[in-house]
């Protein structure tokens, strides 16, 4: 008779469990990489490469794992205890104001600015003005109007881990 | 505070049957997840286990020891209990109960020594 | 049933050193695996659960780690009342096994 261990102890409900007094600051729960059974008796393993769970839980189901769209690279796989790390393909960028797509990194400023910041995954290029040094944050100017630069290279996640 | 007590008869006789007791305080055997188990430990030996029963009535037994091994409880009494039928002096040990949810052994009871001589 | 296996069932140490218990799994039990300690004259204490998560009140020296089928509890800055038996338990599956136990002495 299987004790359930892969993929365990509570009422059956998705979420997150409550923080009420323990007697210890696990107890009832099943551990990262885990999740309780249907029937509340044991902790079931989350099944590497296709869910996960991150804390602490009493869920039911373990969390999908993120699936990395076109124009994103992983940088880091899904296990059971970590949700897959995506990052923008060089080039492109994801604002925190669309963190749905990639967008393309302008290729050059404005004329009259000065590029001060490279093209990241989570950063368009950086433009200031030559005088004054104010950032310029508007749309990308048409091509003639632009000073060519190179986008940068990709350093670090823009789609953080669950 | 989560404390567990177990009761036996100290010394029987082989053949006879076992009954311990094991009476609990600090938690519900009604919550769930909750489950006690009977674990015995023969002098300078290891560790047995031998059965556990759920909040919601379900059992399961040692294999080895499953067709003398009854356990049941009485949640509102806050009590498990244990019969070995048919003892023999290979049952002695101290015998202990422990409550398990969902994981480890986490609150064990004294223990109580039973005899078969 | 699962099997577990500690191959040492006496280790000498001294105070302040540092020691490894092992234990191994005849099967793979993900880290569904408990450490207790047992001093002479008393019942099982927990220290470590989920392979390597330390239960409430257990002092930092006492690590585990481990998964699949080897685990071992580490026991750094070893004091005096270390002194106990150390067993491991798999609850993976029914019936839950438990290790036969590595006694801990000091030299």
């Known amino acids: 008779e299987s004790a359930l261990i892969t993929q365990q102890d509570l009422a059956p409900q998705q979420r997150a469990a409550p923080q009420q007094k323990r007697s210890s600051p696990s107890e009832g729960l099943c551990p990262p990489g885990h999740h309780i059974s249907e029937d509340g008796r044991d902790c079931i393993s989350c099944k590497y490469g296709q869910d996960y769970s991150t804390h602490w839980n009493d869920l039911l189901f373990c969390l999908r794992c993120t699936r990395c769209d076109s124009g994103e690279v992983e940088l880091s796989p899904c296990t059971t205890t970590r949700n897959t790390v995506c990052q923008c393909e060089e080039g492109t960028f994801r604002e925190e104001d669309s963190p749905e797509m990639c967008r393309k990194c302008r290729t050059g400023c404005p004329r009259g600015m000065v590029k001060v910041g490279d093209c990241t995954p989570w950063s368009d290029i950086e433009c200031v003005h030559k005088e004054s040094g104010t950032k310029h944050s508007g749309e990308v100017p048409a091509v003639e109007e632009t000073v060519t630069s190179s986008p940068g290279t990709p350093a670090s996640p823009c789609s953080l881990s669950g | 505070q989560v404390t567990l007590k177990e009761s036996g008869p100290g010394i029987l006789q082989p053949s006879q049957t076992l009954s311990l007791t094991c009476s609990f305080s600090g938690f519900s055997l009604s919550t769930s997840g909750m489950g006690v188990s009977w674990i015995r430990q023969p002098s300078g030996k290891g560790l047995e286990w031998l059965a556990h029963i759920y909040w919601d009535d379900d059992k399961r037994y040692n294999p080895s020891l499953k067709s003398r091994l009854t356990i049941s409880k009485d949640t509102s009494r806050n009590q498990v209990f244990l019969k070995i039928t048919s003892v023999d002096t290979a049952d002695t040990a101290t015998y202990y109960c422990a409550r398990r949810r969902l994981g480890p052994f986490a609150y064990w009871g004294q223990g109580t020594l039973v005899t078969v001589s | 049933d699962i099997v577990m296996t500690q191959s040492h069932k006496f280790m000498s140490t001294s105070v302040g050193d540092r020691v490894s218990i092992t234990c191994k799994a005849s099967?793979?039990?993900?880290?569904?695996v408990a450490w207790y300690q047992q001093k002479p004259g008393q019942s099982p204490k927990l220290l470590i659960y989920?392979?390597?998560t330390r239960h409430t009140g257990v002092p930092d020296r006492f690590t585990g780690s481990g998964s699949g089928t080897d685990f071992t509890l580490t026991i750094s800055n070893v004091q005096s009342e270390d002194l106990a038996d150390y067993f491991c338990?798999?609850?993976?599956?029914?019936?839950?096994?438990f290790g036969g136990g590595t006694k801990l002495e000091i030299k």
């Open positions: 989920w392979a390597s």
């Open positions: 099967q793979d039990v993900g880290t569904a």
């Open positions: 338990q798999q609850y993976s599956s029914y019936p839950y096994t």
